[in-house]
């Protein structure tokens, strides 16, 4: 299963920094409970 990334990790909304939880690098387990890679 592939994981995808937002195209920017942080965006300013009304002067508030919002973290896009998925833009954190490929295949690092950003999606809760999604099996990524193999057993390591």
């Amino acid at each position: 299963d592939a994981e995808f990334r937002h195209d920017s990790g942080y965006e300013v909304h009304h002067q508030k920094l919002v973290f896009f939880a998925e833009d954190v690098g490929s295949n690092k387990g950003a999606i809760i409970g999604l099996m990524v890679g193999g057993v390591v």
Epitope: A30, I32, V40
Partner: antibody
């Protein structure tokens, strides 16, 4: 068998702190993020935050920002979640999740 | 915070019959990259939750294809084409466009 094994149930007084552990068994915990969630009795799921064990980077939900600390010990494949200034509303089952694996949950009861 | 609202909160089902759960988000979960950041989880009785669907329509590994999900930016539906006894539990929708928030859950039980 690959699994995440959490520490046992805890009973704490209001104002105290609790530290829950999550150990990877047959699983290298430093490769993937470790998420922490909780579920109060009869309630839904609530995300607390996550840690990248590779570099210690954390992201916390603003609600918990001032009270939670997530750490890891890669030498023992164990992640930790410490919650301070406990109140009765923190009574819940706390879960760790990494990749497709979920811990069995740790019941934390806050009661005077 | 993005608020996720599910309906119904309780759903009695008949094995072999279809079932559907609705979820609405307070903000569009469709990002400009084309991905919709909507997820479905199932918590079976006495178990930890499990991921069913990720990014609105992708089936997680090992999830039977009787489960499917569709929707727009704010309105989503999880469908079970033919309910089986093992499908009982509490279903949660969730988003991670901005951190993670979950719906209040829909309890599915056999009639």
């Amino acid at each position: 068998q690959v699994q995440l094994v959490q520490s046992g149930a805890e009973v704490k007084k209001p104002g105290a702190s609790v530290k829950v552990s999550c150990k990877g068994s047959g699983f290298n915990i430093k490769v993937y993020y470790v998420h922490w969630l909780r579920q109060a009795p009869g309630k839904g799921l609530e995300w607390i935050g996550r840690i990248d064990p590779e570099n210690g980077e954390t992201i916390y939900t603003p609600k918990f920002q001032d009270r939670v600390t997530m750490t890891e010990d890669t030498s023992t494949d164990t992640a930790y979640m410490e919650l301070s200034s406990l109140r009765s509303e923190d009574t819940a089952v706390y879960y760790c999740v990494s990749s497709g694996y979920w811990g069995q949950g740790t019941l934390v009861t806050v009661s005077s | 915070d993005i608020v996720m609202t599910q309906s119904p909160l309780s759903l009695p089902v008949t094995p072999g019959e279809p079932a559907s759960i609705s979820c609405r988000s307070s903000k569009s979960l469709l990002h400009r990259n084309g991905i919709t950041y909507l997820y479905w989880y199932l918590q079976k009785p006495g178990q930890s939750p499990q991921l069913l669907i990720y990014q609105m329509s992708n089936l997680a590994s090992g999830v039977p294809d009787r489960f499917s999900s569709s929707g727009s930016g704010t309105d989503f539906t999880l469908k079970i084409s033919r309910v089986e006894a093992e499908d009982v539990g509490v279903y949660y929708c969730a988003q991670n466009l901005e951190l993670w928030t979950f719906g209040q859950g829909t309890k599915v039980e056999i009639k």
